[in-house]
């Protein structure tokens, strides 16, 4: 993790890096490694990709252990094959308004992501794309089989932005905060980011937090009850300590994680909050990092890797953050 010890490199000559990822010397000048990319965790030994203008942002001078790969001030963004200047706003589609800031893109929905519970007036609510309309709208199917008594379970309802409006006016400043991005990892420790100007100078800034949707080692499918297809929020039996690049959280946490489905749906955080977590490293250093804590999860078909690159990303975003 730090460069005080002797150089120790893996036996093979050099790792094979994915397309577009630079092969660079680690921060100690010892071994050739695949450079960390925008939003990934970085350390002294695991440097960020210099060819993309990235640096390891440790957050505070006191914490020099683990950072997040961040683009230098003013770095442009590449989104959907188009280059945008830092500070530039653009509509990625009729559904989203986006802003580029120092290499990171934050987007806000232009369409309502409302919810609908069944009622006598709308027993089978469904969101559909109507011809000539950009945003999906609710339709209320009449029962196909009139022998069915009462309402069916509501079709999966897209996550909704609840809580305070992310846009509000404050003394000569239109405060805008994008939703937290989806966690960079589907299991294990990852990073979630957002863009906001909710600060004294009303300047756009990036914020990041650690996130863990579920532990990688958990075999959650075993816990799905017979006859059920999903386990939305599995019960975690014992409190756990989080690990981050060799450092361990000082406190134990009875955290909630998202479950899994056996029918092709994926379960992602829906309501989250952000809390500071202190990590203690082997050398005794303590560092504080903001971390996402899950309140509720939702299981849905808008899974990573769906056709529309941005929509599949958007629908995995975390809503209703309390922090």
């Amino acid at each position: 993790q730090n460069c005080s010890g002797p150089c120790r490199c893996p036996a093979e000559q050099a790792p094979r890096c994915p397309a577009g990822v630079s092969l660079v010397l680690d921060g100690c000048g010892c071994c050739r490694v695949c450079a960390k990319q925008l939003g990934e965790l970085c350390t002294e030994r695991d440097p960020c990709d210099p060819h993309k203008g990235l640096f390891c942002d440790f957050g505070s001078p006191a914490n020099r252990k683990i950072g997040v790969c961040t683009a230098k001030d003013g770095a442009p963004c590449i989104f959907g094959g188009t280059v945008y200047r830092s500070g530039e706003s653009f509509q990625s589609s009729c559904k989203y308004q986006c802003t580029c800031l120092d290499g990171a893109v934050g987007c806000m929905p232009l369409c309502s992501m409302d919810v609908r519970l069944p009622s006598p007036d709308c027993p089978f609510p469904r969101r559909v794309k109507l011809p000539g309309k950009c945003c999906e709208e609710w339709v209320c199917d009449e029962p196909k089989d009139q022998t069915v008594v009462g309402p069916a379970l509501a079709a999966y309802r897209l996550e909704d932005t609840f809580g305070p409006d992310p846009t509000m006016i404050r003394a000569n400043c239109l405060v805008q905060t994008t939703e937290w991005s989806a966690c960079s990892k589907t299991c294990g420790m990852g990073i979630s980011t957002r863009v906001t100007n909710d600060n004294a100078s009303c300047r756009l800034e990036k914020q990041s937090r650690l996130c863990m949707v579920r532990p990688c080692e958990a075999d959650l499918e075993e816990n799905i009850k017979k006859g059920k297809k999903c386990i939305r929020t599995p019960k975690i039996s014992k409190p756990i300590k989080f690990e981050l690049s060799g450092c361990t959280s000082v406190k134990t946490y009875r955290a909630k994680f998202c479950g899994v489905c056996t029918d092709g749906r994926c379960c992602t955080p829906h309501r989250t909050t952000t809390l500071p977590v202190e990590f203690k490293c082997p050398d005794g250093e303590v560092m504080k990092k903001n971390m996402m804590f899950i309140k509720t999860c939702a299981c849905h078909y808008n899974c990573p890797g769906d056709n529309d690159i941005f929509e599949s990303l958007y629908y995995r975003k975390m809503y209703g953050d309390m922090a």
């Epitope: 309502s112 409302d114 069944p118 009622s119 709208e137 008594v149 009462g150 309402p151 379970l153």
Partner: antibody, heavy 114, light 110 residues
């Protein structure tokens, strides 16, 4: 963000007509119905009536002859009218969105007194 | 006149499980009654928790579940939290109108 807001007089004289307006935002009245509910001081909730998304209405039988609910979808407003008010009608009046009564207004307290 | 009856008050310890019920005076509650559960915390607005018997609103924690139990609508809270202390109302649909229950005051012991 979904919101509902009731507005109208806080004081009504007996025999007079109460007119309340529920102004909604964050959803369309052509997609969701709106219910009216009241809560007399120290008591429970009483359902009064609903205007459905397509404009049809249903009323509590006890108030059928006194109640009218209408809407102006373009203005996102629902209007609630109750005639022949009596001191026993003193209550906080709420509008709430159809579909699990998920969103409610803050309520408007109406006192019926001469 | 149709009457919907709830327990006036219930007390539970933090971490415990409690079931609130909603009984109809004219027979068993079915899915056709579209049972709704509404919560009001002290000093806060009402908000819907459950609609259509068992469908949770997005803000409703997973520890809340709606069901039909022995001819009644039921709201079960598992692993009760201090913040669950509130007044809970059920509402049942009867073809042309809703009827609210009298409400249950849930107290979570200190």
């Amino acid at each position: 963000e979904v919101t509902l807001k009731e507005s109208g007089p806080v004081l009504v004289k007996p025999t007079e007509t109460l007119t309340l307006t529920c102004t909604v935002s964050g959803f369309s009245l052509s997609t969701f119905g709106v219910h009216w509910i009241r809560q007399p001081p120290g008591k429970g909730l009483e359902w009064l009536g609903v205007i459905w998304r397509r404009g049809g209405t249903d009323y509590n039988a006890a108030f059928m002859s006194r109640l009218t609910i209408s809407k102006d979808t373009s203005k996102s407003q629902v209007v609630f009218t109750m005639t022949n008010m009596d001191p026993v009608d003193t209550a906080t009046y709420y509008c709430a969105r159809d579909g699990g009564f998920d969103y409610w207004g803050q309520g408007t307290t109406v006192t019926v007194s001469s | 006149e149709t009457v919907v009856t709830q327990e006036p008050s219930l007390t539970v310890s933090p971490g415990g499980t409690v079931t609130l019920t909603c009984r109809s005076s004219i027979g068993a509650v079915t899915t056709s009654n579209y049972a709704n559960w509404v919560q009001q915390k002290p000093g806060q607005a009402f908000r819907g928790l459950i609609g259509g018997t068992s469908n949770r609103a997005p803000w409703t924690p997973a520890r809340f579940s709606g069901s039909l139990l022995g001819g009644k609508a039921a709201l079960t809270l598992s692993g009760v939290q201090p913040e669950d202390e509130a007044e809970y109302y059920c509402a049942l649909w009867y073809s042309t109108h809703y009827v609210f229950g009298g409400g249950t005051k849930l107290t979570v012991l200190g």
